[in-house]
């Protein structure tokens, strides 16, 4: 009876999300394997988040709006492990917008989700950021490693969206 009611709840939750995400990929987790964590298909998952790589070339503001429509934000990178996971799926000759900007050009970098910007957990390429006119951040492959660079916000780039996993 308990299992039945849990299944019914799960199905109704799935139906609720179906209007936003036509398809979800779920895995069982938790100590009793009773919880399901889901990401929209074909997003990838890492820890408690889902990631989507957009190959559409758009300005930073448009890229953020595009993520927002999907219930996400441009990616906020919190750890080296998270960055290493993300970069596995990136093309080395491309650049991708991050959810990091400095709209006033005062070198006050801010994450789109208001996560505090911690200088100790940043992965700027050597010599970056280097221009107060370049107010948006990308991740790209340079000098044999992935790192961040400041670029003009209006110049179209690919982008990475991130959202919290859906738990059902």
């Amino acid at each position: 009876n308990f299992m039945y009611s849990k299944t019914v709840k799960r199905l109704s939750k799935l139906q609720e999300y179906q209007q936003y995400y036509p398809s979800l990929t779920c895995v069982m987790e938790g100590k009793d394997m009773e919880d399901w964590s889901c990401c929209p298909t074909p997003w990838t998952s890492f820890q408690s988040s889902c990631y989507f790589i957009s190959t559409v070339m758009q300005s930073w503001t448009k890229s953020q709006n595009n993520c927002s429509v999907m219930g996400a934000d441009l990616v906020v990178i919190n750890t080296k492990e998270e960055q290493d996971f993300i970069t596995q799926n990136l093309k080395i000759n491309s650049a991708y917008f991050l959810g990091l900007s400095d709209p006033k050009g005062w070198r006050h970098w801010q994450w789109v989700d208001q996560t505090p910007y911690n200088k100790n957990v940043t992965f700027w390429h050597s010599g970056e950021p280097n221009s107060p006119d370049e107010r948006c951040a990308i991740i790209n492959f340079r000098s044999e490693e992935w790192g961040w660079n400041d670029v003009h916000c209006h110049v179209p780039q690919k982008s990475i969206c991130k959202m919290k996993k859906i738990y059902i």
Epitope: S59, T61, Q64, N65, P103, N130, S131, R135, H154, P156
Partner: antibody
């Protein structure tokens, strides 16, 4: 006083090449992104090319991509526009303009007086 | 590309009255509190001159009778009271994404 003086405009034939120059003074030229903007005979303003302050980025609309090249010489405080395979629709008054970044975008705070290009057979 | 449509194409306003020029963008040129529309004035035989940046910020040296407002896709330039020297063409411009684009212009005549 900020000044920008364009030169090099001429009457040319379709298919010809031409180089425009813009001599800047009264500001630290190397610190600013610069653009060329043209005004067509019907008075419409049309962006033609942009170059970033550090010379690292250049951008063009599809209408001139592959035919026009923007460049700068920071030592000479001069902006250039090399134009080739010119068409009659390139006929316009060409302005150089200084860019000021504002939040996620930019505007043009100073414009030169312009130089006229006429493409006609 | 973002298309900017200005209206009216021309208008005649009596001295001391209000002139209102509209600029509509084909998609939003705002992001959160940033409204990325700019306005220029062009007198015959002269280059465009910046009046307003960021929808409502008056450029240094521009008289306070000029004001701008708007967000997302709809922006307005107001001139009040209109003076003789305001006879000119007015253009809106966006650069939230490449390519930067301009409106078709509005010609203001003083009656």
């Amino acid at each position: 006083e900020v000044q920008m003086v364009e030169s090099g405009g001429d009457l040319v034939k379709p298919g010809d090449s031409l180089k425009l120059s813009c001599a800047a003074s009264g500001f630290t030229f190397r610190s600013y992104g610069m653009s060329w903007v043209r005004q067509t005979p019907d008075k419409r303003l049309e962006w033609v090319a942009t170059i970033s302050s550090g010379d690292s980025y250049t951008y063009y609309p599809d209408s001139v991509k592959g035919r026009f090249t923007i460049s700068r010489d920071n030592a000479k405080n001069t902006l250039y526009l090399q134009m080739s395979s010119l068409k009659s629709e390139d006929t316009a008054l060409y302005y150089c303009a200084r860019q000021i970044y504002y939040d996620y975008a930019y505007y043009f705070d100073f414009w030169g007086q312009g130089t006229t290009l006429t493409v006609s057979s | 590309d973002i298309v900017l449509t200005q209206s009216p194409a021309s208008l005649a306003v009596s001295l001391g009255q209000r002139a209102t020029i509209s600029c509509r963008a084909s998609e939003s040129v705002s992001f959160r509190t940033s409204h990325l529309m700019h306005w220029y004035q062009q007198k015959p035989g002269q280059p465009p001159k910046l009046l307003i940046y960021g929808a409502s910020n008056l450029e240094s040296g521009v008289p306070a009778r000029f004001s701008g407002s708007g967000s997302e896709t709809d922006f307005t330039l107001n001139i009040h009271p209109v003076e003789e020297e305001d006879a000119a063409a007015y253009f809106c411009q966006q650069s939230i994404e490449d390519p930067p684009t301009f409106g078709g212009g509005t010609k203001l005549e003083i009656k």
